[in-house]
């Protein structure tokens, strides 16, 4: 598992819609793989975390002034859709094939 | 200033190119305003932090399982270019008007 000491990476995060109160409108699935971006953005930032120039700059400044400036943060840089069955305004079960931005496709340092 | 207890926002970060070792190729400016994204992504996520659906989901899961899942992170969501004077391969001082991704334009929760 990706702890604070490990490098920024995508890890599993199973989300149950009941846990977050979304089961009132999402019929199915009951849960899905959301993934989570975990780990640190350590110097030097590797290519696989696709750092922006700003993230590289912030990492270098953090290296010199660690108490003044934070490290870059490991976050989703690309998201994927999931398909959900939900109830519309009339209560009709409706399938949304692409419910965008629900699952992490890629993580990076920003 | 935006501390850990404050909400995600853009704060000043003056970067001196000498401090990060980039003065060897960037002639001018000597320093620039990079900005930094600081502060927490607390529930409920406000519109001004332009949360993705995944960030909203992760925030809700963190609310229920705070030790298992982290909060969303306050990061640059839009970057701006700066202009820099650098030396080309022949040592000719050259102006790059748009050196992309160097300064934070907007912060958000991701």
């Amino acid at each position: 598992s990706a702890g604070a000491g490990s490098h920024c990476q995508k890890t599993s995060l199973r989300v149950n819609f009941e846990d977050i109160g979304w089961d009132s409108w999402i019929i199915a699935p009951k849960e899905y793989e959301a993934y989570e971006c975990k780990g640190g953005c350590f110097f030097p930032l590797a290519d696989d975390v696709t750092p922006t120039k700003h993230a590289i700059v912030q990492t270098l400044v953090h290296l010199k002034f660690p108490t003044k400036v934070g490290k870059a943060c490991c976050v989703p840089t690309k998201l994927s859709p999931i398909s959900v069955l939900y109830k519309d305004d009339m209560g009709v079960p409706t399938l949304k094939y692409h419910y965008e931005g629900m699952s992490v496709a890629e993580c990076g340092c920003r | 200033s935006a501390g850990a207890g404050s909400h995600c926002q853009k704060t000043s970060l003056r970067v001196n190119f000498e401090d990060i070792g980039w003065d060897s190729w960037i002639i001018a400016p000597k320093e620039y305003e990079a900005y930094e994204c600081k502060g927490g992504c607390f529930f409920p996520l406000a519109d001004d932090v332009t949360p993705t659906k995944h960030a909203i989901v992760q925030t809700l899961v963190h609310l229920k399982f705070p030790t298992k899942v982290g909060k969303a992170c306050c990061v640059p969501t839009k970057l701006s270019p700066i202009s820099v004077l650098y030396k080309d391969d022949m040592g000719v001082p050259t102006l790059k008007y748009h050196y992309e991704g160097m300064s934070v334009a907007e912060c958000g929760c991701r």
């Epitope: - | 001018a28 400016p29 000597k30 320093e31 700066i82 202009s83 022949m90 001082p93 050259t94 102006l95």
Partner: antibody
Framework: EVQLVESRGGLVQPGGSMRLSCAAS????????MNWVRQAPGKGLEWVAH??????????HYAESVRGRFTISRDDSKSSLYLQMNSLKTEDTGVYYC??????????WGQGTLVTVSS | DIVMTQSPDSLAVSLGERATINCRAS??????????MNWFQQKPGQPPKLLIY???NQGSGVPDRFSGSGSGTDFTLTISSLQAEDVAVYFC?????????FGQGTKLEIK
């Protein structure tokens, strides 16, 4: 070694025409803005014209004093710069320098060529 | 157009002494935190040579005795210890706006 060599200038009558050329070597000609700068006898330096890169669609700019009379052009395949001067006036007399550089500075200079406009 | 005005027009300095040439622009030549100001040296019968760029950076092969300073509209070229080979005309030049313009020149001689 960077070299810019201007063609021989000469004497031309007022109202006449002359074409200057400049042969470049020692650097990647197509990567640099090219300019003509002139210097009247015993006087200061005056930027005349520049031509930018292919990526800028070879955009040109001229000093007000020569606009409509002078035309700057380049041939990247020959590493050559040109200045076509028409409707010449006595005040166009001077040493014409071919210069290369960036969007920031005149970095490379030729030795210059003397153009004399006189009747 | 941005007008560049140098002072003095001519200057006589003893060998080993400091020489200072000033240049004033009719408007600021700074932008993006960068000074669009260069200095050239022209010796008799030769083309100009880049001495200082971006107000304070030495050109390639330029001796350390040459330095530049200033920002905005006021700039200075300093020769810390004048040598015989420094006899020349010095020009300031701005590249912030087309047309790129030069100062009228300052003639430096040995006293």
């Amino acid at each position: 070694e960077v070299q810019l060599v201007e063609s021989r200038g000469g004497l031309v009558q007022p109202g006449g025409s002359m074409r200057l050329s400049c042969a470049a070597s020692g650097f990647t000609f197509s990567n640099y803005w090219m300019n003509w700068v002139r210097q009247a006898p015993g006087k200061g330096l005056e930027w005349v014209a520049h031509i930018r890169l292919k990526s800028d669609n070879y955009a040109t700019h001229y000093a007000e004093s020569v606009r409509g009379r002078f035309t700057i052009s380049r041939d990247d395949s020959k590493s050559s710069l040109y200045l076509q001067m028409n409707s010449l006036k006595t005040e166009d007399t001077g040493v014409y320098y071919c210069t290369g550089g960036s969007n920031y500075v005149f970095a490379f200079w030729g030795q210059g060529t003397l153009v004399t406009v006189s009747s | 157009d941005i007008v560049m005005t140098q002072s003095p027009d001519s200057l006589a300095v003893s060998l080993g002494e400091r020489a200072t040439i000033n240049c004033r622009a009719s408007e600021s030549v700074d932008n993006y935190g960068i000074s669009f100001m260069n200095w050239f040296q022209q010796k008799p019968g030769q083309p100009p040579k880049l001495l200082i760029y971006a107000a304070s950076n030495q050109g390639s092969g330029v001796p350390d005795r040459f330095s530049g300073s200033g920002s905005g509209t006021d700039f200075t070229l300093t020769i810390s210890s004048l040598q015989a080979e420094d006899v020349a005309v010095y020009f300031c030049q701005q590249s912030k706006e087309v047309p790129w313009t030069f100062g009228q020149g300052t003639k430096l001689e040995i006293k």
